[in-house]
């Protein structure tokens, strides 16, 4: 069986945000029927990556890749093996470890978020970058922005493109 | 079981190359005892990412994340489930789909490499970027450079840090 990638629209949105490319972000958000407030929230996160420069995008891309290819995520596939192999399919859901990281990025404290990142990538430069991004997001985003970002994530996770 | 990430040193090297950061690359290469010719080969690949600009780094990061989190890679974990679960461990090897992509990047034709990327990310802008990088690498690297890059990859895959 040629197995589909895991929730491609999530990674499209993540990389559009981290890249700082508004045109790519808008194109991705269009595909999940994002609202104007949801877009505003994502733009605020994107601003943090842009302000923090290239190194921020690369290091956070490294974190995302590391978590996505981690054995925590591999493990998710393993848990459902018996049922999945009977059906000869594997679900396309986003890995819970990735979901958890994104949730903490929005709703956790800086310490909680950095601690989660450290489980996967303990390089000091990576953790410092994670803290800078988290502090920036907390400074830029209102509670309403964060709720809008979470509602957009729900749309992404439940999208047919996921 | 808290499962370790898959071959972290590989992703450290990949992101250092794609980022264009020589200091990060040297730091990673030191950890796998890279020789001078192996380092030279990696620098040539790094030059291609730098010349092709930010969008190249981001798009190739997206490809790497997509393959690493694809169900082809998840599937690798699943194949060995019975044995692995008995031992309550999962191997830390790099996913064969990632390995295959890197091998084709070095030794395949541009068409073969782009075809492999297209299985995971068919966005035209991604495939165009993959072709540009591949053509650049073929133009910059001698056969000897490519052999050195492959020998470095063997060191990475067999490293205790993988």
């Amino acid at each position: 069986v040629k197995m589909a990638e895991t929730c491609p629209i999530f990674y499209d949105v993540f990389f559009a945000v981290a890249n700082g490319n508004e045109l790519l972000l808008d194109l991705s958000l269009t595909k999940v029927n994002a609202t104007e407030p949801e877009r505003t929230a994502m733009k605020k996160i994107q601003d943090c990556y842009v302000e923090n420069g290239l190194i921020s995008r690369v290091l956070d891309g490294l974190v995302m890749t590391t978590i996505s290819s981690s054995k925590d995520c591999m493990g998710e596939a393993v848990q459902n093996t018996v049922e999945d192999l009977k059906l000869n399919t594997l679900g396309r859901e986003i890995c819970p470890a990735v979901k958890r990281g994104v949730d903490l990025f929005l709703t956790g404290t800086p310490d909680e978020y950095v601690e989660q990142v450290a489980q996967y990538k303990a390089l000091p430069v990576v953790l410092e970058n994670a803290r800078i991004l988290k502090n920036c997001v907390d400074a830029k985003m209102t509670e309403e922005d964060k709720e809008n970002a979470l509602s957009l994530l729900d749309k992404i996770y439940t999208s047919p493109l996921c | 079981v808290k499962m370790a990430e898959t071959c972290p040193i590989f992703y450290d090297v990949f992101f250092a190359v794609a980022n264009g950061n020589e200091l990060l690359l040297d730091l990673s290469l030191t950890k796998v005892n890279a020789t001078e010719p192996e380092r030279t080969a990696m620098k040539k690949i790094q030059d291609c990412y730098v010349e092709n600009g930010l969008i190249s780094r981001v798009l190739d990061g997206l490809v790497m994340t997509t393959i690493s989190s694809s169900k082809d890679c998840m599937g690798e974990a699943v194949q060995n489930t019975v044995e692995d679960l008995k031992l309550n461990t999962l191997g830390r090897e790099i996913c064969p789909a990632v390995k295959r992509g890197v091998d084709l990047f070095l030794t395949g034709t541009p068409d073969e490499y782009v075809e492999q990327v297209a299985q995971y990310k068919a966005l035209p802008v991604v495939l165009e970027n993959a072709r540009i990088l591949k053509n650049c690498v073929d133009a910059k690297m001698t056969e000897e450079d490519k052999e050195n890059a492959l020998s470095l990859l063997d060191k990475i895959y067999t490293s205790p840090l993988c």
Epitope: G20, N21, E22, L23, L24, D26, L27, L29, T30, K31, N33, A34, R39, V50 | A122, L123, P124, V125
Partner: antibody, heavy 120, light 107 residues
């Protein structure tokens, strides 16, 4: 009433440069992404380049990448296309167009175009 | 890049005729397709976006359908002002590409 007026076209030598401008009025310019589209004489439409509402992000067709640069000045409600290393095949009528909105980037308003001729 | 092809490339019709133009995409583009009309010496005009949504001010005799790789533009009853060239455009991914056009002229 939305209006887009292009200027800056003319005759250029191969390898030469031109800078096109597009003056926008009748809408809140800094809320919309903008695009350049060209049309060679007697031919079809060819998308050239797009720029986001803030001007932070751009995308260009491979045929012009590294030679043409799209930019905007939101304080002047003006879109630009800097064309360098011009080639004969760049000869065309160049239109600027407004994106309908961020979540469906069709081009709902177009200028009347400015003609660029590249010839020695 | 995503390639678009249009059929027919040239079409002769009479006032009152029902006209159908087809656009094919080289890969699936969901409903991210638009149709434009262009008259000689004029800028293109947006007719339909999202494959089937009529742009405001466009007469209801124009309609669009399709999804994925095959799309159609239909003019239910051709009027004298409809003689023009029609282009499809994909907006699924950059670079945005146009079809080669279909010229509709008077039989």
């Amino acid at each position: 009433e939305v209006q887009l007026v292009e200027s800056g076209g003319g005759l250029a030598q191969p390898g030469g440069s031109l800078r096109l401008s597009c003056a926008a009025s009748g809408f809140t310019f800094n809320n919309y992404a903008m695009t350049w589209v060209r049309q060679a004489p007697g031919k079809g439409l060819d998308w050239v380049s797009a720029i986001s509402d803030s001007g932070r992000s751009t995308f260009s067709a491979d045929s012009v990448k590294g030679r043409f640069t799209i930019s905007r000045d939101n304080s002047k409600n003006t879109l630009y296309l800097q064309m360098d290393s011009l080639r004969a095949e760049d000869t065309a009528l160049y239109y600027c167009a407004k994106h309908r909105n961020w979540n469906y980037p069709v081009f709902d308003y177009w200028g009347q175009g400015t003609l660029v001729t590249v010839s020695s | 890049d995503i390639q678009l092809t249009q059929s027919p490339s040239f079409l002769s019709a009479s006032v009152g005729d029902r006209v159908t133009i087809t656009c094919w995409a080289s890969q699936g583009i969901s409903s991210y397709l638009a149709w434009y009309q262009q008259k000689p010496g004029k800028a293109p005009k947006l007719l339909i976006y999202s494959a089937s949504t009529l742009q405001s001010g466009v007469p209801s005799r124009f309609s669009g359908s399709g999804s994925g790789t095959e799309f159609t533009l239909t003019i239910s009853s051709l009027q004298p002002e409809d003689f023009a060239t029609y282009y499809c455009q994909q907006l699924n991914s950059y670079p945005f590409t146009f079809g080669p056009g279909t010229k509709v002229d008077i039989k």
